[in-house]
Interface confidence: low
């Protein structure tokens, strides 16, 4: 009686159970009762990474330097080329097909967290006693000058966005 | 299909600024960049820079020399062009064209064009 | 920037006859080139993207080809509604960068 199901590593067809091609390989011809199923290796720029019956391989995805792509990890017969973006760029989408700039943080926030290639930016405001003048990428929120610690005394209030101003004491003669 | 609508034409003068609006029937141009490309009298095609919705990152054609911003409104799904310090050579047919960000710059959607007009 | 120079400027075609536009790229740019339609009063139409991959809705008589710095449009069988001006645009580096246009008229 022909078989309903197969084996891990083999399919079902014309009611017979044929050997799936390896990863790295694609399927030429399927078994028949005489012969077994026929694979060939991948080409350079291709891949297959499952146990398959696939009879084309799957083109390496390319890292478009025009979308801000680089290679991470190069392709083999059995894995896909890894795209990671270049400096200063992020993923658009978790699977990177395209990158986008890091965001800057305005004047009055700063990095919590730099950027990597998969994520942006993390700004927060700066909180009471901190300011940030810039917008960057890079800079987190710096702490207002402490004006006692050089025997001044503070001038002008600081905001989020700029230091206190510090000038002499008034001295009483 | 996304279809984009641009604001109307625009006269403006010498050196003061105009910004135009292009709203997509997309929500929040979700999946998609956006292009900005103008057309000046019997001139070919200049892109002018692209706008990635999703988290407003811009990349500009540096001819434009930070005359021109691009921003969007996602909850509007409606991207801007502004281009301050106008001359007469930007008279022109200004376009907005949305791409997938697979293929980020196929351009395979385009508003109608809007025309501004710089003239004392 | 990278400078794409398009030829002949004007193209005298019979309907039903062949049209070979080129394309020249001042530098390397692979494949990553789009080609445009555009018609009096109307915006750019997208014909073809990375050289020669056809727009989903696009006649089969449009056709694109070429790498590096030389890159064909081909329109096998001229019909009335292709006479228009037709623009390449390179996208493998900032700036992205057109043609000056070439103008298929009616013979």
């Known amino acids: 009686e022909p078989p309903t199901a197969c084996r891990e590593k083999q399919y079902l067809i014309n009611s017979q159970c044929c050997s799936l091609c390896q990863p790295g390989q694609k399927l030429v011809s399927d078994c028949t009762e005489f012969t077994e199923t026929e694979c060939l290796p991948c080409s350079e720029s291709e891949f297959l990474d499952t146990w398959n019956r696939e009879t084309r391989c799957h083109q390496h995805k390319y890292c478009d330097p025009n979308l801000g792509l680089r290679v991470q990890q190069k392709g083999t017969s059995e894995t896909d080329t890894i795209c990671t973006c270049e400096e200063g760029l992020h993923c658009m989408s978790e699977s990177c097909e395209s990158c986008v700039p890091h965001r800057s943080c305005l004047p009055g926030f700063g990095v919590k967290q730099i950027a990597t290639g998969v994520s942006d930016t993390i700004c927060e405001p700066c909180p009471v006693g901190f300011f940030s003048n810039v917008s960057s990428a890079f800079e987190k929120c710096r702490p207002w000058t402490s004006c006692e610690t050089k025997d001044l005394v503070v001038q002008q209030a600081g905001t989020n966005k700029t230091d206190v101003v510090c000038g002499p004491q008034d001295r009483q003669r | 299909q996304v279809q984009l609508v641009q604001s109307g034409a625009e006269v403006k003068k010498p050196g003061a600024s105009v910004k135009v609006s292009c709203k997509a029937s997309v929500y929040s141009f979700t999946g998609y960049t956006v292009n900005w490309v103008r057309q000046a009298p019997g001139q070919r095609l200049e892109w002018m820079g692209l706008?990635?919705?999703?988290?407003?990152?811009?990349t500009y054609n540096q001819k434009f020399k930070g005359r021109v911003t691009l921003t969007i409104d996602k909850s509007a799904s409606t991207a801007y062009m502004e281009l301050s310090s106008l001359r007469s050579e930007d008279t022109a047919v200004y376009y907005c064209?949305?791409?997938?960000?697979?293929?980020?710059?196929?351009?395979?959607?385009w508003g109608q064009g809007t025309l501004v007009t710089v003239s004392s | 920037e990278i400078v794409m120079t398009q030829s002949p400027a004007t193209l005298s075609v019979s309907p039903g006859e062949r049209a070979t536009l080129s394309c020249k790229a001042s530098?390397?740019?692979?494949?990553?080139v789009a080609w445009y339609q555009q018609k009096p009063g109307q915006a750019p139409r997208l014909l073809i993207y990375?050289?020669?991959d056809r727009r989903t809705g696009i006649p089969a008589r449009f056709s694109g080809s070429g790498s590096g710095t030389e890159f064909t449009l081909t329109i096998s069988s001229l019909q009335s509604e292709d006479f228009a001006v037709y623009y390449c645009l390179q996208h493998w580096n900032y700036p992205l960068t057109f043609g000056q246009g070439t103008k298929v008229e009616i013979k």
């Open positions: 064209a949305s791409s997938r960000y697979s293929n980020p710059y196929a351009m395979d959607y």
């Open positions: 706008i990635v919705p999703y988290n407003g990152g811009t």
């Open positions: 530098q390397n740019v692979h494949t990553r």
């Open positions: 990375l050289a020669s």
